[in-house]
Interface confidence: medium
Amino acid sequence: AKLGAVYTEGGFVEGVNKKLSLLGGDSVDIFKGIPFATAKTLENPQRHPGWQGTLKATNFKKRCLQATITQDNTYGQEDCLYLNIWVPQGRKQVSHNLPVMVWIYGGAFLMGSGQGANFLKNYLYDGEEIATRGNVIVVTFNYRVGPLGFLSTGDANLPGNFGLRDQHMAIAWVKRNIAAFGGDPDNITIFGESAGAASVSLQTLSPYNKGLIRRAISQSGMALSPWAIQKNPLFWAKTIAKKVGCPTEDTGKMAACLKITDPRALTLAYKLPVKKQEYPVVHYLAFIPVIDGDFIPDDPINLYNNTADIDYIAGINNMDGHLFATIDVPAVDKTKQTVTEEDFYRLVSGHTVAKGLKGAQATFDIYTESWAQDPSQENMKKTVVAFETDVLFLIPTEIALAQHKAHAKSAKTYSYLFSHPSRMPIYPKWMGADHADDLQYVFGKPFATPLGYRPQDRAVSKAMIAYWTNFARSGDPNMGNSPVPTHWYPYTLENGNYLDITKTITSASMKEHLREKFLKFWAVTFEVLPTVTGDQDTLTPPEDDSEVAPDPPSDDSQVVPVPPTDDSVEAQMPATIGF
């Protein structure tokens, strides 16, 4: 069976029907490049006006305008708000009332696209394997990133969150139109990784999505993550404005000027430094969501009532922090280089600024306790990775799980740890699952490109797709079309239950209280330490391209400051960054 032309609010769309075997039978209808909204530079998205005739939805559209990996050029385009749909079809009748899974990509709110990285037309976020194996509809889409998606003056002149509003428009479009593709508009699951996972979290917290989202999955990211909310948007807006020659004293004039500036210039006016800096790399992420008093009306911690009826799976990779550790402490990955106490203390200090010296000391002490018994470089490097993993991913996720559970009415809560080790041959032997390592398994790459994977990788992929799509179907990862290797029990506040996802999942894979000692430290010991006030006022970046980056703006509400970017850094960004 195949859909043919489908009528949507914008007009007719026609995709392609791809047979899953030479013998016919099962197939998948694929629609690429359906417009779901339009947007002017630094303006909220609007509904797409539609089209005449039948739109041939057969090719992915270009990504939203963003800097290239080398950050010296741009690619993509401003006209980018398009979505893609995969609809699994059986032999005889077209599908009806299928669960819908809407994917939100990561990329530090700075890069990425709905189709994901591409190698010889093999796109990372190809929804085919999830759709056909789980019998669900998969939707991916583009949203604005970088300055064009998240630049904000912190007031009504440029409220920011344009990229989040794009995401909302896509979800709302799916709600309104997916029935025509055979989807159940009352059973939408949003899922995402890293910045996409934090976006998923923010979408569930936003009052704008009330009634749109039934379930959610956050993979390595939360609204509570320290890198997910910008507390000093005006500082960064002024930084960009100065670079492109716009006035900075009056936010109205600044906004008006920025809106008529070449979007490529705006995009290239910001560079993420990827060489080792004074502060951890995540604190240089300037253009990210803000608390705008509207789309995100309050601090995310105060919005969990909005998730009371949204089922949630949240988890992390066991070495999610590795990618960031390799930037912050480069010796972590270099067998011939050593990590020193000073390296780690500097890293700890950079992540504990709000609690001052006492915070840095207490944190350093608890994380280095094992060093006395095992002073090996391997142990020290693993500590660096564990610390980054905890601060950036584990602790925010655990707090979010507890908040979700505490506010739940009908909603169910599930937690996981992805521990299948990275397949990167250059990584140390002790390496676990790095940031973004889970993506290939969720998207079924071991099946789509079998020659590049082992049987154990297919086992992991099969299990993840089964749990994810069962959850989308029923709200319970154990119940649905797909058999699962073991029962995944819900998260409870008492036991902190989580599923440890490895190549062999058994009943022993259900575990409790992940890194409880460290969770207690952050939630209790660290939390009660007095917050220190920064001495400096908000400083502006240097006028020249010197190596010296100014101190970050002082902001007592931040867990860590966000230092300005340094124009002199032209280093290539890690191609694997999924954040």
Epitope: E341, G356, L357, D365, T368, W371
Partner: antibody, heavy 119, light 105 residues
Framework: QVQLVQSGAEVKKPGASVKVSCKAS????????MHWVRQAPGQGLEWMGV????????SYAQKFKGRVTMTRDTSTSTVYMELSSLRSEDTAVYYC????????????WGQGTLVTVSS | DIQMTQSPSSLSASVGDRVTITCRAS?????LNWYQQKPGKAPKLLIY???RLPSGVPSRFSGSGSGTDFTLTISSLQPEDFATYYC????????FGQGTKLEIK
């Protein structure tokens, strides 16, 4: 590299006060506590107190409370230790010492300042 | 206050000897630090957190122990090791042992 340079030797009369300085360089001054330790001639080491250069917070050993004051000047990356109501038994070499990392040991020491209390 | 008692207070040994200095804490502590001091010089950190060596400290120095009893061991004495050694506990009010003077026999 980390350097702690202390002020020169002092000779004081009983009942007077002395103020010893310790200028830090080679690291972020506000990121590490600074301690003061003294050593009387031929004797062992005695901890006097500590200051957090970031916010100026101090903690003094019980024995010296009321007599010792530790301050800092972030503009010059200098800490000071003032000891009042001096007596002959305060004759000692006074050291400033910076934390190693975290709340661990005293990893970097000044060269010491000899304070002689004599009438 | 936590009391730190070192033994012996002085010790004579020869180059190449294996030497052990002990430190007893009352009440028990988690970690201990050791310092070396030569005449007319500031103390130098030798071992921290009971057993960790700062960079630059030779591997002939080692530390062990827990609770109340801790030891500093020099596996093979070198001429430059003759000095006074102090143990120290780190709490809200740190205290040092009275010192052990290691002399040439």
């Amino acid at each position: 590299q980390v350097q702690l340079v202390q002020s020169g030797a002092e000779v004081k009369k009983p009942g007077a006060s002395v103020k010893v300085s310790c200028k830090a360089s080679g690291y972020t001054f506000t990121s590490y506590n600074m301690h003061w330790v003294r050593q009387a001639p031929g004797q062992g080491l005695e901890w006097m107190g500590v200051i957090n250069p970031g916010d100026g917070a101090t903690s003094y050993a019980q024995k010296f409370k009321g007599r010792v004051t530790m301050t800092r000047d972030t503009s010059t990356s200098t800490v000071y230790m003032e000891l009042s109501s001096l007596r002959s038994e305060d004759t000692a070499v006074y050291y400033c010492a910076r934390d190693y990392y975290g709340s661990s040991p005293l990893g970097y020491w000044g060269q010491g300042t000899l304070v002689t209390v004599s009438s | 206050d936590i009391q730190m008692t070192q033994s012996p207070s002085s010790l004579s040994a020869s180059v190449g000897d294996r030497v052990t200095i002990t430190c007893r804490a009352s009440p028990s502590i988690s970690y201990l630090n050791w310092y070396q001091q030569k005449p007319g010089k500031a103390p130098k950190l030798l071992i921290y957190a009971t057993s960790r060596l700062p960079s630059g400290v030779p591997s002939r120095f080692s530390g062990s122990g827990s609770g109340t009893d801790f030891t500093l061991t020099i596996s093979s004495l070198q001429p430059e090791d003759f000095a006074t050694y102090y143990c120290q506990q780190r709490s809200s009010s740190p205290t040092f042992g009275q010192g052990t003077k290691l002399e040439i026999k």
